[in-house]
């Protein structure tokens, strides 16, 4: 699947829009809001039911080139006594992001979009039971 | 920028770094997986910490829809389906990498653009402040 | 069987105002939590903004926090809402929500439409 064109027809294409070869597309990888920081609730991967460890992929042919995951420490979740409940289960939670791959062919360079799934942390969730007849 | 191993029967001209602007190929590699989360999995309603997703559609950004959650309690889902407000349900954050039309409505001229998106909802034991 | 009733929906313009009020059956001073949770359209009931029993007020995200405000009339029995700078994404069925002795109660709700 391609990049969906504009389909609306008060997007028509402005005089301004930088000359492109076929196939491809002009990507600045300087990002927008790059500075933002994420403000979430003090270590939730901790203090969660269902907590999680993080790890950090690095791949210099990426951008970017650190990518981190979430593992859930458990299969099942953590009970008000602090002790694994098997009853319930502790499941990834994920979100897609892309990512810019180059790729050497040679001495020349190519650069393509890539779709990665990222793990973020877990939930805990009743486990889906199926009865055999 | 990044730096990267270069091959050493290159000319020494090649930037190390990721250039500020690259041309990149339409087509996604493994633009395939499941963008909509309703359908990759029920978490959201069968967790303790249950969420809503809400459609969140930009035409000028790709991809053009994303999905945000919303918890739907405050405190968390317990054995006898009530809310336990000794438990908080949060939302679960994630800095994304999308594009950005730009110039504004040109079909082939991006710029990355990081969002901040709730993926989900996790149930954590709140933090006490106690006062002296 | 404790009951909540839901006034003060209606149809109203962008950046307009309305005030929901709940009427409680019991005592909202006994209550483990009292506040509001809407529906959107095709979506589940979520929490907006909660007062739990130590009197602590809770708003859902943001969005909601500084053009909502919840409150609590201990003597009348009553919860309200005060809405302010609706927006089309307000649109949803408004519920009253209360909790005593470990279990939630909801009422029927209140149809609150945002036109642009």
């Known amino acids: 699947r391609k990049i969906p064109k504009v389909g609306h027809t008060f997007f028509q294409k402005p005089e301004s829009c930088p000359p492109v070869p076929g196939g491809s597309m002009k990507l600045d990888i300087g990002i927008i809001n790059e500075n933002q920081r994420v403000s979430m609730s003090r270590n939730i991967e901790s203090r969660s039911t269902s907590p999680w460890n993080y790890t950090v992929t690095w791949d210099p042919n990426r951008y970017p080139s650190e990518v981190v995951q979430a593992q859930c420490r458990n299969l099942g979740c953590i009970n008000a006594q602090g002790k694994e409940d098997i009853s319930m289960n502790s499941v990834p939670i994920q979100q897609e992001t892309l990512v810019v791959r180059r790729k050497h062919q040679g001495c020349s360079v190519s650069f393509q979009l890539e779709k990665v799934l990222v793990t973020v942390g877990c939930t805990c969730v009743t486990p889906v039971i199926h009865h055999v007849q | 920028g990044i730096t990267i191993p270069r091959n050493p029967g290159c000319p020494n001209s090649e930037d190390k770094n990721f250039p500020r602007t690259v041309m990149v190929n339409l087509n996604i590699h493994n633009r395939n997986t499941n963008t909509n989360p309703k359908r990759s999995s029920d978490y959201y309603n069968r967790s303790t910490s249950p969420w809503n997703l809400h459609r969140n559609e930009d035409p000028e950004r790709y991809p053009s829809v994303i999905w945000e959650a919303k918890c739907r309690h405050l405190g968390c889902i317990n054995a006898d389906g009530n809310v336990d407000y000794h438990m908080n349900s949060v939302p679960i954050q994630q800095e994304i990498l999308v594009l950005r039309r730009e110039p504004p409505h040109c079909p082939n001229s991006f710029r990355l653009e990081k969002i901040l998106v709730s993926v989900g909802c996790t149930c954590v034991t709140p933090i006490v402040h106690h006062v002296a | 069987e404790v009951q909540l009733v839901e006034s003060g929906g209606g149809l109203v313009q962008a950046g307009g105002s309305l005030r929901l009020s709940c009427a409680a059956s019991d005592s909202v001073f006994t209550a483990k939590a009292v506040g509001w949770y809407r529906q959107p359209p095709g979506l589940q009931r979520e929490w907006v903004a909660i007062i739990t029993s130590g009197g602590k007020t809770n708003y859902a995200d943001s969005s909601v926090k500084g053009r909502f405000t919840v409150s609590v009339d201990k003597v009348k029995n009553t919860v309200t809402l005060q809405m302010n700078s609706l927006k089309p994404e307000d649109t949803a069925v408004y519920y009253c929500?209360?909790?005593?002795?470990?279990?939630?109660?909801w009422g029927q709700g209140t149809q609150v439409t945002v036109s642009s």
């Open positions: 929500y209360a909790q005593w002795m470990g279990r939630d109660y």
